[in-house]
Interface confidence: medium
């Protein structure tokens, strides 16, 4: 776990787990079939998902100055996606196999968020949007949209932890 009082997290552990997250996110939503045929419906959107942006202090300078801003943002995102993956969007029909990568992804998101959460310290978490598609195909489409935005999120997080492990580890 991260040490209380805003000290550095276990960068190397975080790096390893975030790399695993990247692999799982891509296996949960790889390209399938004749991708020219893929086109999104506009039934549901995932505009409310967290993004790591310029002002979040996740750039090399920001991480050097105070990594807590960036780590808090990453933590919020991890909790947000962990909640989404545990919601009926993913547990409802169409059913996923019990050992699907989504299940492993869910557990790994929780693992990394716990690694970042300082003991006795609770960062604010973002409210997940109330997305409840009525049709199974809409739910399936929403799953893929969520997974695609998660791929982007964990890719940035993995780069942050790789940088931290290389330059900020004690």
């Amino acid at each position: 776990r991260a040490v209380p009082g805003g000290s550095s997290p276990a960068w190397t552990q975080c790096q390893q787990l975030s790399q695993k997250l990247c692999t799982l996110a891509w296996s949960a939503h790889p390209l399938v079939g004749h991708m020219d045929l893929r086109e999104e419906g506009d039934e549901e959107t995932t505009n409310d998902v967290p993004h790591i942006q310029c002002g979040d202090g996740c750039d090399p300078q920001g991480l050097r100055d105070n990594s807590q801003f960036c780590l808090q943002r990453i933590h919020q995102g991890l909790i947000f996606y962990e909640k989404l993956l545990g919601s009926d969007i993913f547990t409802g029909e169409p059913s996923l196999l019990p050992d699907s990568p989504v299940g492993q992804l869910h557990a790994s998101l929780l693992g990394l968020s716990q690694l970042l959460q300082p003991e006795g310290h609770h960062w604010e978490t973002q409210q997940i949007p109330s997305l409840s598609p009525s049709q199974p195909w809409q739910r399936l489409l929403l799953r893929f949209k969520i997974l695609r935005s998660l791929q982007a999120f964990v890719a940035v997080a993995a780069r942050v932890f790789a940088h931290g492990a290389a330059t900020l580890s004690p």
Epitope: V32, G33, E39, F144
Partner: antibody, heavy 124, light 111 residues
């Protein structure tokens, strides 16, 4: 009620052309992938062609590639299949169907509902 | 292309009794994303096909719960817990992992 209604089938000589139509109602046609599937008399089902909601991308079975063209007019809620250079082996009942599976696999699947079909007979 | 086989090709059934149809693919239909890309369709006599099961095991809207799909990889099964007279017709499996291909069909009729 979600409905698909095919038309345009008939008797045509080998080498001839036909244009099939599929009129959709009861759903927002412009949001859905659509497909054509055919069934030769007394035989099984064969996927023919698919099209994305905008009409901007299409895909064909090898057996019809270069001869058939799938298209759609979202303003008219209608799907089309232009069939040229017809052969005896194209004789079949042609069904259009709404394709829900393209949101999980680019190949499609999960076809629901299907139209009642239109019969195409290629014979001299 | 992936080849699909079904067995039996003909299945005489007794109303009230269970029935089972097997579908095999020449390669696994289980994708790494956790979905089996297999559908089941029923074509009743003189009618167009109708969707029964999608993605291996999910019952389509309006399909009676006596129908169930199971299996993974290359071996799939469609079960009817208690056959009714209206269940007669030809049952097709279809793979959607690669270029779409249907099985040859299983004709179910009353004994």
């Amino acid at each position: 009620e979600v409905q698909l209604l095919e038309s345009g089938g008939g008797l045509v000589q080998p080498g001839g052309s036909l244009r099939l139509s599929c009129a959709a109602s009861g759903f927002t046609f412009s949001r859905y992938h659509m497909v054509w599937v055919r069934q030769a008399p007394g035989k099984g089902l064969e996927w023919v062609s698919s099209i994305v909601p905008s009409g901007g991308s299409t895909h064909y079975a090898d057996s019809v590639k270069g001869r058939f063209t799938i298209s759609r007019d979202n303003s008219k809620n209608t799907l089309y299949l232009q069939m040229n250079s017809l052969r005896a082996e194209d004789t079949a009942m042609y069904y259009c169907a709404r394709d829900l599976g393209s949101y999980s696999s680019g190949w499609g699947g999960w076809f629901d509902p299907w139209g009642q079909g239109t019969l195409v007979t290629v014979s001299s | 292309d992936i080849q699909m086989t079904q067995s039996p090709l003909s299945l005489p059934v007794t109303p009230g009794e269970p029935a089972s149809i097997s579908c095999r693919s020449s390669q696994s239909l289980l994708h790494s994303n956790g979905y089996n890309y297999l559908d089941w369709y029923l074509q009743k006599p003189g009618q167009s096909p109708q969707l029964l099961i999608y993605l291996g095991s999910n019952r389509a809207s309006g399909v009676p719960d006596r129908f169930s799909g199971s299996g993974s990889g290359t071996d799939f099964t469609l079960k009817i817990s208690r056959v009714e007279a209206e269940d007669v017709g030809v049952y097709y499996c279809m793979q959607a992992l690669q270029t779409l291909t249907f099985g040859p069909g299983t004709k179910v009729d009353i004994k």
